[in-house]
Interface confidence: low
């Protein structure tokens, strides 16, 4: 014969547990039932009576199976610097996440306590990393033969254009300006020629995904160990 | 006030490693990189890598294979750790805070520490 | 790796006098920075993006360059400008330094 099903509550066999979505209620000594998601215990369980669950008020929510006497406060309205990714509801809190163009400076359990703005690139640097949602934009200044002549917080250091005849050499922040003959840019996707005469033999490619830079003309390191690039000579 | 702040060991037996934490104030470790940076008789100043804001480590080259250095945002501090010491490694360690948005100049610099590696 | 030249190596001026002092790389670079040591002090920023003048540093000093050759200029030496002066580059990894140049006052 199967076992009898114990219904809530019962007393549990000598050194036993209670089973799922049940807790042991110390002054009762009973196992009793647990409330769900969006309810709390609004009456606790007695020898003879199965604890009694009541619906979380407006504000307040509970995210898991639950004994707890009141529901837990929604967090505050999200500041003018985040935008609502998640509504406060009976069973989840509010969750705050930063706006485009913003960081999280200092992240909570969920959400985010303090959004930053995104560092922008002179004239002069580009993007070397990215911002994440949890991490500042890092600018790099640009390296000879390419450049940057925007304030950015996503433009990369570009290739100078490579002209027949240089009417005025780029530098870092400006384009090189060709005579009227048309420039000729060479320019394949992910592969960029760099006028002579730069040295690229210790510049390494850049460690963040597309969009990329041309090779070379980084000057950050892979990150963590790794082999030089090939060609590098390693002096 | 921007501070920043090396402590190490002082002394370390040759093979072993140095461990040196660098605790910095006044700024927060996810809006700059920290450098690392010895100085000795012999060779002068000599980079050694960095820690991004990021969380993002670059190493020099000639370090790479036995240097690691990692952060914890929420204490404000610098770990960083060198493998394989010998006696050249003899040198004052710096930590340095470097300018993620864009100056790159490490503008402030911890007091250092020595580091003597003997027997 | 892009090896930096100092030179002179040493160098003593009297007060008033003009000081260039220069900074050689082995390849071409975006920008120079300089910082000032004294004895028993950690290094200062002292000229960052080649020719801006850090924090604190008077206008008699100033610094110019491009490519491979870059120079540090006091218009007229004072005595607390006795200290050694690095020049450093980050075009390309590893980030390197020059050997540095003594400036002593007369």
């Known amino acids: 014969l199967p076992a009898q099903v114990a219904f809530t509550p019962y007393a549990p066999e000598p050194g036993g547990t209670c089973r799922l979505r049940e807790y042991y209620d110390q002054t009762a000594q009973m196992c009793c039932s647990k409330c769900p998601p969006g309810q709390h215990a609004k009456v606790f369980c007695t020898k003879t009576s199965d604890t009694v669950c009541d619906s979380c008020e407006d504000s307040t929510y509970t995210q898991l199976w639950n004994w707890v006497p009141e529901c837990l406060s929604c967090g505050s309205r999200c500041s003018s610097d985040q935008v609502e990714t998640q509504a406060c509801t009976r069973e989840q809190n509010r969750i705050c996440t930063c706006r485009p163009g913003w960081y999280c400076a200092l992240s909570k359990q969920e959400g985010c306590r303090l959004c930053a703005q995104l560092r922008k690139c002179r004239p002069g640097f580009g993007v070397a990393r990215p911002g994440t949602e949890t991490s500042d934009v890092v600018c790099k200044p640009c390296a000879p033969g390419t450049f940057s002549n925007t304030t950015s917080s996503t433009d990369i250091c570009r290739p100078h254009q490579i002209c027949h005849v240089v009417a005025i050499p780029g530098n870092a922040s400006m384009d090189a300006v060709c005579t009227s003959t048309s420039p000729t840019r060479s320019m394949a996707p992910g592969a960029v020629h760099l006028p002579q005469p730069v040295s690229t033999r210790s510049q390494h490619t850049q460690p963040t995904p597309a969009p990329s830079t041309a090779p070379g003309t980084s000057f950050l390191l892979p990150v963590g160990p790794s082999p030089p690039a090939e060609g590098s000579t390693g002096d | 006030e921007v501070q920043l702040q090396e402590s190490g060991p002082g002394l370390v037996q040759p093979s072993q490693s140095l461990s040196i934490t660098c605790t910095v104030s006044g700024f927060s470790l996810t809006s700059y990189g920290v450098h690392w940076v010895r100085q000795s008789p012999g060779k002068g100043l000599e980079w050694l890598g960095l820690i991004w804001s990021d969380g993002s480590p670059d190493y020099s080259a000639a370090f790479i294979s036995r240097l690691s250095i990692n952060k914890d945002n929420s204490k404000s501090q610098v770990f960083f750790k060198m493998n394989s010491l010998q006696a050249d490694d003899t040198a004052i360690y710096y930590c340095a805070r470097n300018d993620d948005g864009g100056d790159y100049v490490m503008d402030y610099w911890g007091q250092g520490t020595t580091v003597t590696v003997s027997s | 790796e892009i090896v930096l030249t100092q030179s002179p190596a040493l160098m003593s001026a009297s007060p008033g006098e003009k000081v260039t002092m220069t900074c050689s790389a082995s390849?071409?670079?975006?920008?120079m920075y300089w910082y000032q040591q004294k004895p028993r002090s950690s290094p200062k920023p002292w000229i960052y993006l080649t020719s801006n003048l850090a924090s604190g540093v008077p206008a008699r000093f100033s610094g110019s360059g491009s490519g491979t050759s870059y120079s540090l200029t006091i218009s007229s030496m004072e005595a607390e400008d006795a200290a050694t002066y690095y020049c450093?580059?980050?075009?390309?990894?590893?980030?390197?330094f020059g050997a540095g140049t003594k400036l002593e006052i007369k």
């Open positions: 390849s071409s670079v975006s920008y």
């Open positions: 450093q580059q980050w075009t390309s990894n590893p980030l390197t």
